[in-house]
Amino acid sequence: APTSSSTKKTQLQLEHLLLDLQMILNGINNYKNPKLTRMLTFKFYMPKKATELKHLQCLEEELKPLEEVLNLAQSKNFHLRPRDLISNINVIVLELKGSETTFMCEYADETATIVEFLNRWITFCQSIISTLT
């Protein structure tokens, strides 16, 4: 059974994941982002179901494509490079879903834009956090 300290740790990790996903979305949604139109042409796979931590496998499998799209920003100055963000997200995702469990991700038939993709995983984090508090 999960202890209160392990629940607290899970909640904190989910909050950190949520914050970085939101920040990426902030950057993409920035109306001054000249690469937004190009970014929106890339398609992401969405999970058929995302209600448990094991479903983060579906996010993990899309992190490389996400990094590639973020690299399109090609800012002359990154505070955080896409690889810094994706590396941190990957560490959090691995800790949350556990590396022992082998879960085969099932994807929805319809693909999504980067904005829809990020919003889906932001909603996932918020939903799981709400069950922990």
Partner: nanobody
């Protein structure tokens, strides 16, 4: 509008340590990047280190292994622990706040704090 208040600069001998702090207040996004940049006389401003509210970090190659950036999300404060300081670390250190991972004109900058490394 975001206000940034820096502290912790000063004069230190080579090999010494300093800890910089920067507190942000005002219209703060919960998801943001805070970081430190520096500008030495006659040189361009350069990134030292940055950290997101989710814990993602980026360090300049020249400070890796010597400087550590951390933050307290509850206090909207970022810290830069600087160890094994070298004369070439001498510069004005500026705190930065951004709502995105890349620099743009919506970013906010502190007034700067002087760090001098000299014997």
């Amino acid at each position: 509008e975001v206000q940034l208040v820096e502290s912790g600069g000063g004069l230190v001998q080579p090999g010494g340590s300093l800890r910089l702090s920067c507190a942000a207040s005002g219209s703060i996004f919960s998801s943001n990047v805070m970081g430190w940049y520096r500008q030495a006389p006659g040189k361009q401003r350069e990134l030292v280190a940055a950290i997101s509210s989710g814990g993602s970090t980026n360090y300049a190659d020249s400070v890796k292994g010597r400087f550590t950036i951390s933050r307290d999300n509850a206090k909207n404060t970022v810290y830069l622990q600087m160890n094994s300081l070298k004369p070439e670390d001498t510069a004005v250190y500026y705190c930065a706040y951004a709502s995105s991972f890349y620099e743009d004109e919506t970013d906010y900058w502190g007034q700067g704090t002087q760090v001098t490394v000299s014997s």
